[in-house]
């Protein structure tokens, strides 16, 4: 259940997250499963553990194997396994199937290709993108944050896309590449002004002090894949990341669901260890696309 496959190329950086995730304050110990030997935490080592992350800087083919992570959570020490395979670099242009990440689909209206696993790394923009080993050039291609946007997508744009970036660790730079297939769908869709399904406008959500609470912002934006659509939370009119309260976090990555053929997104706001002062805040669920922005406000009240 808590085992994960990870792969990389020799002489590149590879960072693996423990499949058994705990809270940030929990200690995580890493071991070579075969020898039960502890993996060091000192950064001077080529392979070292850093909390929930196991870092190969850079990776070698001999690093392949199963690694055990033990999360020192209360009551139980919980175990996860990372099955790591490091491959030799290919001399030709073909990227073998075993190095491919999940395929993504796009259409004329939406052509985002996310760079796989990039969230684990300390990288700075811009990303370099390649299609079938050729560097992408031209105004149709835009590298934006951790994804590539292709304007006016055509069926010929299908193929294997590789992102390349630099991971920085204590001033040293390491190259990372990741490849995924992109397919093009012919889709007759439309977009409309965002419709927020939850929460209701001016909703009062009952919470218990000291416990965790989740608020879900859910909105639909039209039919088919949407080119630009987003849902997010604000606290007192401020972005969550700027608000500076570590107990209150948005769930990373927006879930895309299709309800009755409609393209919908939701974003979960997680409030850990609810405090009295959280009841004083204004929680805004924002949904926006090319048509505009809609806002629904929620307030918290103490459960009796």
């Amino acid at each position: 259940k808590f085992s994960k496959q990870s792969w990389g190329l020799e002489n590149e950086a590879l960072i693996v997250r423990c499949p058994r995730q705990g809270k940030p304050s929990y200690t995580v110990d890493w071991y070579y499963s075969q020898t039960n030997k502890s993996i060091p935490t000192q950064e001077r080592n080529r392979v070292f553990a850093s909390g929930q992350l196991l870092k190969f800087l850079p990776a070698e083919v001999a690093d392949s194997g199963i690694y055990t992570c033990i999360v020192r959570s209360p009551t139980f020490n919980r175990t996860g396994y990372a099955n790591v395979t490091i491959y030799k670099k290919q001399s030709d242009c073909n990227v073998p199937d075993y190095l491919m990440y999940s395929t993504v689909s796009g259409s004329e209206k939406n052509s985002k290709i996310y760079c796989p696993t990039i969230d684990l790394y300390n990288w700075t923009a811009p990303l370099e993108w390649f299609k079938n080993c050729q560097a992408l050039q031209g105004s149709r291609y835009r590298a934006h944050k951790s994804f590539l946007v292709i304007d006016n997508v055509m069926t010929e744009d299908a193929g294997d896309y590789t992102c390349k970036f630099i991971h920085n660790e204590n001033g040293a730079n390491y190259s990372v590449t990741a490849t995924r297939s992109f397919t093009v769908k012919d889709e007759q869709g439309f977009s409309l002004f965002p419709v927020i399904g939850a929460p209701a406008q001016n909703e009062i959500k009952e919470v218990e002090i000291g416990k965790n609470a989740n608020l879900t912002c859910s909105a639909c934006f039209g039919k088919g894949t949407q080119f630009l659509a987003a849902v997010l939370w604000q606290l007192n009119g401020t972005k969550i990341t700027d608000f500076g309260e570590p107990r209150i976090q948005q769930e990373e990555g927006q879930n895309q669901s299709f309800s009755n053929g409609l393209a919908c997104l939701d974003m979960v706001l997680r409030i850990a260890d609810v405090k009295e002062e959280d009841l004083l805040l204004q929680y805004d669920c924002l949904a926006l696309n090319l048509h505009g922005l809609r806002r629904h406000t929620v307030r918290l009240s103490r459960k009796n």
């Epitope: 058994r20 009551t75 139980f76 919980r78």
Partner: antibody, heavy 122, light 111 residues
Framework: EVQLVESGGGLVQPGGSLRLSCAAS????????MHWIRQAPGKNLEWVSA???????YYPGSVKGRFTISREDAKNSLYLQMNSLRAGDTAVYYC????????????????WGQGTTVTVSS | DIVMTQSPLSLPVTPGEPASISCRSS???????????LDWYLQKPGQSPQLLIY???NRASGVPDRFTGSGSGTDFTLKISRVEAEDVGVYYC????????FGGGTKVEIK
């Protein structure tokens, strides 16, 4: 209503086997750590075994190798297979809910069953 | 293994009067997340145990506010501000830092 109901207790001879079941309802069973806790007649509470949401199992030395805890999330059920039973295993066995192993939230052992009696005697 | 020691073994009480039970652990129950993994349970005669206090000082849902948990590190206390007749039974402390270990119990009975 959040509820745990144990069954399967009874009289068994030393060296025999017994399988206890616990039916859970009223909560998302699959995300919780679950425990078996026992109480010998007139004695204190003793932790017997636990299973987390991944299916990893935990036992004290006194029952390791003899007892096996398991769960069937699709049926909201917890089990305890007890082999090589001894007179010292005679007790009321409680099924109990632990922390939320998904979110790592702990609110105590907050739900207990009514208990099922196991008697090991010749 | 963490060993839990409770005192007193027996506690005769007068309704309306306060009562206090002590619990000591063989090692600190403070986890790296900042919480003390110490709970208090009450087992009334003929019943299953019920949770009173979790994480050292948090009252469980539905527990009257006359029950208060306090303490840190290895020393913890359960206080009943004004004992009522329904409070009789055996009180157990339990650590949940490393698996589960129960204290020996304190029998509270009306004088």
């Amino acid at each position: 209503e959040v509820q745990l109901v144990e069954s399967g207790g009874g009289l068994v001879q030393p060296g025999g086997s017994l399988r206890l079941s616990c039916a859970a309802s009223g909560f998302t069973f699959s995300t919780y750590d679950m425990h078996w806790i026992r109480q010998a007649p007139g004695k204190n509470l003793e932790w017997v075994s636990a299973i987390d949401l991944a299916g990893d199992t935990y036992y004290p030395g006194s029952v390791k190798g003899r007892f096996t805890i398991s769960r069937e999330d699709a049926k909201n059920s917890l089990y305890l297979q007890m082999n090589s039973l001894r007179a010292g295993d005679t007790a009321v066995y409680y099924c109990a809910r632990g922390g939320d192993g998904y979110n790592y939230d702990y609110y105590g052992i907050d739900v207990w069953g009514q208990g099922t009696t196991v008697t090991v005697s010749s | 293994d963490i060993v839990m020691t409770q005192s007193p073994l027996s506690l005769p009480v007068t309704p309306g009067e306060p009562a206090s039970i002590s619990c000591r652990s063989s090692q600190s129950l403070l986890h790296s997340d900042g919480y003390h993994y110490l709970d208090w349970y009450l087992q009334k005669p003929g019943q299953s145990p019920q949770l009173l206090i979790y994480l050292g000082s948090n009252r469980a849902s539905g527990v009257p506010d006359r029950f208060t948990g306090s303490g840190s590190g290895t020393d913890f206390t359960l206080k009943i501000s004004r004992v009522e007749a329904e409070d009789v039974g055996v009180y157990y402390c339990m650590q949940a830092l490393q698996i589960l270990t129960f204290g020996g119990g304190t029998k509270v009975e009306i004088k």
